[in-house]
């Protein structure tokens, strides 16, 4: 019996087609992805093959103005329109709190939404009961397939799930649910979830009875053969893991942003054992036409976005200096504003020991593309912010050793004075450079804001200590020559859309007046 699994993950609000790098589509003839194009390909496969499941491994939420405006209603609407069979909860599904998940998505989705390792407690338990499930048995033709969901246990550090959801260890939570499916005579089981490729592989290895793992979170690109676009494969598709009980378990992921549709064909024997598995992600490029009906619906929903982008978010009473003449040479108040917004967006998970889990921000000055003039009645709009941060990136959370941070700051000024983009703007950091010294030895003082303290203060950076830092995904991926970050980071979790982070902060503050205050000397 053959099953076709179509899968997406980390779509992050890319409802419209995008450019090849998943930013705003400029030249339509070279654009990719989007739900209208995805629908065309999905329908093509559904028509050609008998047993097809369309699955999503989480993080539909967060990433473009679509999510900012529609807050998840767009996810439910278009996933329903594409007729998804199941979805696993990702960490970003909690970005607007539990209410922001329940109302727009859980109550509106026609398909089951899954996670076995999230347990509700207190008053939330009854409110959310039945709205998401640990598993679902799906009929496919004359057979049944069990889908069991999981979500990153780091979600409380990455999003806003509140205090009434407990995120258990994935493997510990999955095993009893898989065992339950086995007792229901379900012998074909897919683990669908959002914890990253390393955890996906562990699930394949450790959870008895899981036949296939469909993952997300790490934006992993797997491919067999010559890859069709810019993404470099992290391994073959499917990636085969030998389980502890000796089975060959295929593990798949489909990069991110709706650029690819994962396509996996699995052959099962009559006892539900995987006999063979093969496939590849399908690049959703312009050779696949956008479905006209879905496209028309997208255009209808788009109208509200255009109206939103010109509305006032808040006011500034000072000039927001985002000029390259400032931000690539010295501390600039636009850099301070953005870093303060980045930290504010990550205020969560305080306890008796820590006032917050992260206090530091770094931001390449070259990523700040425009100033905002306060003389326009002080008005700040989404449109203004899109000019400052035009690349459609995210502000991510990484863990780095102090020694890596020191290298990053040396790199920041290794060729100072040439108006290059690597000059770092900061938050929660005080750095002193001596530019008379030779490159690689110019950082003379580097103090960082403590997190394990009741009164935050600046302490000298310790080389062997592990620090959490918020930074643009561009830097986490080694951009602007920050190879040491990419090579030495100990953990990387994708965060929220950059413009959204700053716009939320400005809306919250109402009136802003960031200063140049001696963070960089």
């Amino acid at each position: 019996w053959e099953l076709t699994i179509l899968h997406t993950n980390d779509v992050h609000s890319r409802l419209e087609q995008t450019s090849e790098d998943s930013s705003k589509c400029v030249n339509a003839s070279r654009c990719m992805g989007g739900v209208a194009r995805l629908f065309t390909k999905v329908q093509q496969i559904r028509r050609a093959e008998p047993n097809v499941l369309l699955l999503d491994a989480g993080d539909q939420y967060q990433g473009t103005i679509w999510f900012t405006v529609y807050k998840g209603a767009e996810v439910a609407h278009f996933m329903n329109a594409l007729r998804y069979d199941a979805m696993a909860l990702g960490n970003h599904e909690f970005d607007n709190g539990v209410e922001g998940l329940i109302e727009p998505l859980l109550k509106e989705a026609k398909f089951p939404i899954l996670s076995a390792n999230i347990k509700a407690k207190g008053p939330l338990a009854s409110q959310i009961s039945g709205l998401y499930l640990p598993y679902k048995v799906l009929p496919v033709g004359d057979e049944v397939v069990g889908i069991v969901g999981y979500t990153s246990k780091e979600t409380p550090f990455l999003s806003n799930p509140g205090t009434n959801l407990v995120f258990e260890d994935e493997i510990t939570a999955l095993q009893p649910e898989v065992d339950k499916l086995k007792t229901l005579n379900v012998n074909k089981i897919i683990a669908l979830g959002h914890s990253g490729f390393e955890t996906d592989k562990l699930i394949a290895q450790k959870v008895r009875g899981v036949d296939v793992v469909v993952g997300g979170h790490s934006n992993t690109f797997l491919y067999t053969g010559n890859p069709p676009s810019k993404e470099v494969p992290a391994g073959k598709y499917p990636f085969i893991v030998t389980s502890d009980d000796g089975r060959k378990v295929p593990v798949v992921q489909a990069y991110a942003f709706g650029k690819y549709l994962g396509y996996l064909k699995i052959e099962f024997d009559e006892r539900g054992n995987v006999i063979s598995s093969h496939g590849n992600p399908i690049l959703l490029n312009s050779s696949i036409p956008e479905d006209p009906s879905i496209k028309a619906d997208i255009n209808k929903w788009r109208i509200k976005l255009d109206n939103y982008s010109t509305q006032e978010l808040g006011k500034t009473i000072v000039y927001l200096d985002g000029s390259s003449q400032s931000c690539r040479f010295r501390e600039c108040n636009m850099g301070n504003l953005i870093c303060d917004a980045m930290i504010n967006n990550n205020l969560r998970h305080a306890d008796e020991m820590f006032w917050n889990h992260v206090s530091m921000c770094i931001l390449n000055g070259g990523g700040i593309r425009s100033p905002i003039d306060e003389r326009n009645n002080g008005t700040i709009t989404w449109e203004n912010l899109a000019a400052v941060l035009p690349f459609g990136g995210t502000f991510d959370l990484v863990q780095l050793k102090g020694s890596t941070l020191k290298k990053a700051f040396e790199h920041s000024v290794h060729r100072y004075g040439q108006s290059t983009g690597e000059f770092l703007q900061v938050g929660g950091i005080h750095v002193v450079y001596d530019l008379s010294r030779k490159p690689g030895d110019r950082v003379v003082k580097l103090d960082v804001l403590c997190t394990k303290c009741r009164v935050p203060s600046y302490d000298p950076l310790k080389m062997d200590e592990i620090y959490k830092v918020i930074l643009p995904n561009f830097l986490a991926n080694g951009g602007d020559g920050f190879q040491m970050i990419k090579d030495e980071l100990l953990r990387h979790d994708s965060g929220d859309q950059d413009i959204n982070v700053v716009s939320t902060y400005i809306s919250k503050m109402k009136v802003i007046y960031p200063a140049v205050e001696g963070r960089i000397k």
């Epitope: 007729r83 026609k110 033709g141 479905d291």
Partner: antibody
Framework: QVQLVESGGGVVQPGRSLRLSCAAS????????MHWVRQAPGKGLEWVAV????????YYPDSVKGRFTISRDNSKNTLYLQMNSLRAEDTAVYYC??????????????WGQGTMVTVSS | DIQMTQSPSSLSASVGDRVTITCRAS??????LAWYQQKPEKAPKSLIY???SLQSGVPSRFSGSGSGTDFTLTISSLQPEDFATYYC?????????FGGGTKVEIK
């Protein structure tokens, strides 16, 4: 082979009740949404009810809502339509039809031969 | 509710003719449209689903096209056994609705 056989039709007075059955064979009944569709004499097709594969959801058009109830017994591979408060305009051939395997609306790939219901005093 | 309008309501054609029947939805239904054939005193038979996919066992002279609101059923070369009534049906949303039917008669 795949087959649907309806039964239970007949002549009934207005205001009375009737229960139709549909016996399924040749496929995994519990995996499919099942529908009732009717056709008044000399008229077109009208959808009457659906019950999803697991019985979790049922949908009806306004014309029968509150009067007709669809149900299924997966252990007996049987679909039912309980029709109460029958009216003259309910007179039709009632077909049982197989839908899809999910919770989305679907088309009908297999049809029964139909059973005639006549509502007349 | 989504209204389905079929045209023509009847047509006369000869064996070998190319026949086209149209179906219009009152609102967009993407490609969630099916076509059925019904002969007198018989149950309907599924021909096409998802606007253009041929049900297994249906001759290739039948084809469907369209998306959104406008759909077409084409019989490329009418055969004697094709004289029947044809119905379209939307399954975009409940309540499911049928077109009024097109009766194809012998000229």
């Amino acid at each position: 082979q795949v087959q649907l056989v309806e039964s239970g039709g007949g002549v009934v007075q207005p205001g009375r009740s009737l229960r139709l059955s549909c016996a399924a064979s040749g496929f995994t009944f519990s995996n499919y949404g099942m529908h009732w569709v009717r056709q008044a004499p000399g008229k077109g097709l009208e959808w009457v009810a659906v019950i999803l594969y697991d019985g979790s959801n049922k949908y009806y058009p306004d014309s029968v809502k509150g009067r007709f109830t669809i149900s299924r017994d997966n252990s007996k591979n049987t679909l039912y339509l309980q029709m109460n408060s029958l009216r003259a305009e309910d007179t039709a051939v009632y077909y049982c039809a197989r839908g899809g395997s999910s919770w989305y609306p679907d088309s009908f790939d297999i049809w029964g031969q139909g059973t005639m219901v006549t509502v007349s005093s | 509710d989504i209204q389905m309008t079929q045209s023509p309501s009847s047509l006369s054609a000869s064996v070998g003719d190319r026949v086209t029947i149209t179906c219009r939805a009152s609102q967009g239904i993407s490609s969630w449209l099916a076509w059925y054939q019904q002969k007198p005193e018989k149950a309907p038979k599924s021909l096409i689903y998802a606007a253009s996919s041929l049900q297994s066992g249906v001759p290739s002279r039948f084809s469907g096209s369209g998306s959104g609101t406008d759909f077409t059923l084409t019989i490329s070369s009418l055969q004697p056994e094709d004289f029947a009534t044809y119905y379209c049906q939307q399954y975009n949303s409940y309540p499911l609705t049928f077109g009024g039917g097109t009766k194809v008669e012998i000229k």
